[in-house]
């Protein structure tokens, strides 16, 4: 997946620093207090959706074949989304105020693609 | 996730019949010749992203918290995408013209959500 570098408007991964204190979540998340979560942005022209490594699934490729032939669903915009997310450990208070360590999936955007 | 019923413009699952003959894939896919693959469409207002069951990840919820506070990344559109996909068996010709049966992941959109 592309890294956003200011020179592309295509779907890419933008580095993004997340600080739990800024959103008031530091009252229940103990650690980490911040991390690079990143996000996806940019355009998804038709030729990008369904490209292996860019498409998030077989389904995306099939739907894109329909679009390229002018068939329905032609009106649905292709979307720049995370295609690879990674896990991160967290220490936090649960509902009963116990401290819990959990490996939380989908915390960090590693790659973006058009779906 | 919502089912598209013609009465909502919110992110929902639209039933969609996929026929491999229409996209010329019947020359390598033996079975099935068609199936309901479905797709996602509709708008994603800020309040929908990050709602459990609608958000595709913890990451979505965090980024949405930033948006709701007017912080970056505020300009990135939330996107109606598959949050649950299911597997389907296929019979097809591989590159060496052997007939192969494979359980292909991400063939059918089961639920949609805002990411």
């Amino acid at each position: 997946g592309l890294e956003c570098d200011g020179r592309t408007n295509l779907c890419c991964r933008q580095q993004f620093f997340i600080d739990f204190r800024l959103i008031g979540w530091n009252d229940w998340i103990i650690a980490p207090t911040s991390y690079y979560g990143n996000y996806c942005e940019g355009s998804c022209p038709a030729y990008l959706a369904g490209v292996p490594g860019s498409a998030s699934s077989f389904h995306t490729a099939v739907v894109n074949q329909y679009r390229m032939r002018g068939l329905n669903p032609g009106t649905v915009n292709s979307c720049c989304i995370p295609t690879k997310l990674s896990t991160m450990s967290m220490l936090y208070f649960d509902d009963e105020y116990n401290i819990v360590k959990r490996d939380v999936p989908n915390m960090i955007v590693e790659e973006c693609g058009c779906a | 996730g919502l089912e598209c019923d013609g009465r909502t413009n919110l992110c929902c699952r639209q039933q969609f019949f996929i026929d491999f003959r229409l996209i010329g894939w019947n020359d390598w896919i033996i079975a099935p010749t068609s199936y309901y693959g479905n797709y996602c469409e509709g708008s994603c207002p800020a309040y929908l992203a990050g709602v459990p069951g609608s958000a595709s990840s913890f990451h979505t919820a965090v980024v949405n918290q930033y948006r709701m506070r007017g912080l970056n990344p505020g300009t990135v559109n939330s996107c109606c995408i598959p949050t649950k996909l299911s597997t389907m068996s296929m019979l097809y010709f591989d590159d060496e013209y052997n007939i192969v049966k494979r359980d292909v992941p991400n063939m059918i959109v089961e639920e949609c959500g805002c990411a």
Epitope: I30, P32, T33, S34, Y35, T87, S89, L91, I99, K101 | -
Partner: antibody, heavy 126, light 108 residues
Framework: EVQLVESGGGVVQPGGSLRLSCAAS????????MHWVRQAPGKGLEWVSL????????YYADPVKGRFTISRDNSKNSLYLQMNSLRTEDTALYYC???????????????????WGQGTTVTVSS | DIQMTQSPSSLSASVGDRVTITCRAS??????LNWYQQKPGKAPKLLIY???SLQSGVPSRFSGSGSGTDFTLTISSLQPEDFATYYC??????????FGQGTRLEIK
Amino acid sequence: EVQLVESGGGVVQPGGSLRLSCAASTFTFDDFAMHWVRQAPGKGLEWVSLITGDGGSTYYADPVKGRFTISRDNSKNSLYLQMNSLRTEDTALYYCVKDWWIAARPDYYYYGMDVWGQGTTVTVSS
Amino acid sequence: DIQMTQSPSSLSASVGDRVTITCRASQSISSYLNWYQQKPGKAPKLLIYAASSLQSGVPSRFSGSGSGTDFTLTISSLQPEDFATYYCQQSYSTPPITFGQGTRLEIK
């Protein structure tokens, strides 16, 4: 079941070298930092060294600094400890240990050791 | 480096007893403390993390408390399989990672 299996221990003379290996199975090896911890006969636990998941950072206890080198090969799910200039006080059972924390940048670790190997014995004697 | 001191270094107790082991850090480590159990001839096992949280699969008779510099591990009703050596470990600072010297729990 997550498993760690050490090998490479043995008897060596003072000033000699040994290379310990640890083979990991059934977990995403490169997600986790790995440690070597040793235990001299009849003594307590002593942390020896640590390497982060990507191999980018390494740390050592003062008694082994400059003599031991920790490394990993994520493609082989393997951890190593190269031990040079061995001393009699290095005699111990050496454990390969998985850390339990999956870190992200900026690297925040809460070091905890949730999976231990069975240990490999290193004897330094003349 | 942060030093960890356990007391007592050994103790004798009977099945059914309530047992407390203490661990003191040379400087404040907040709640970043882990406890391990080691049985003879076996590798250590993580019992408690973050001073008071039970690791998955550990019996509820084990509990931990404390914050700052003083911590305790309590076994509410000693079982035969609990006779072992117990170690505390601080996880507050960057390495070196330090363990306490251990507390050996023996059958009276």
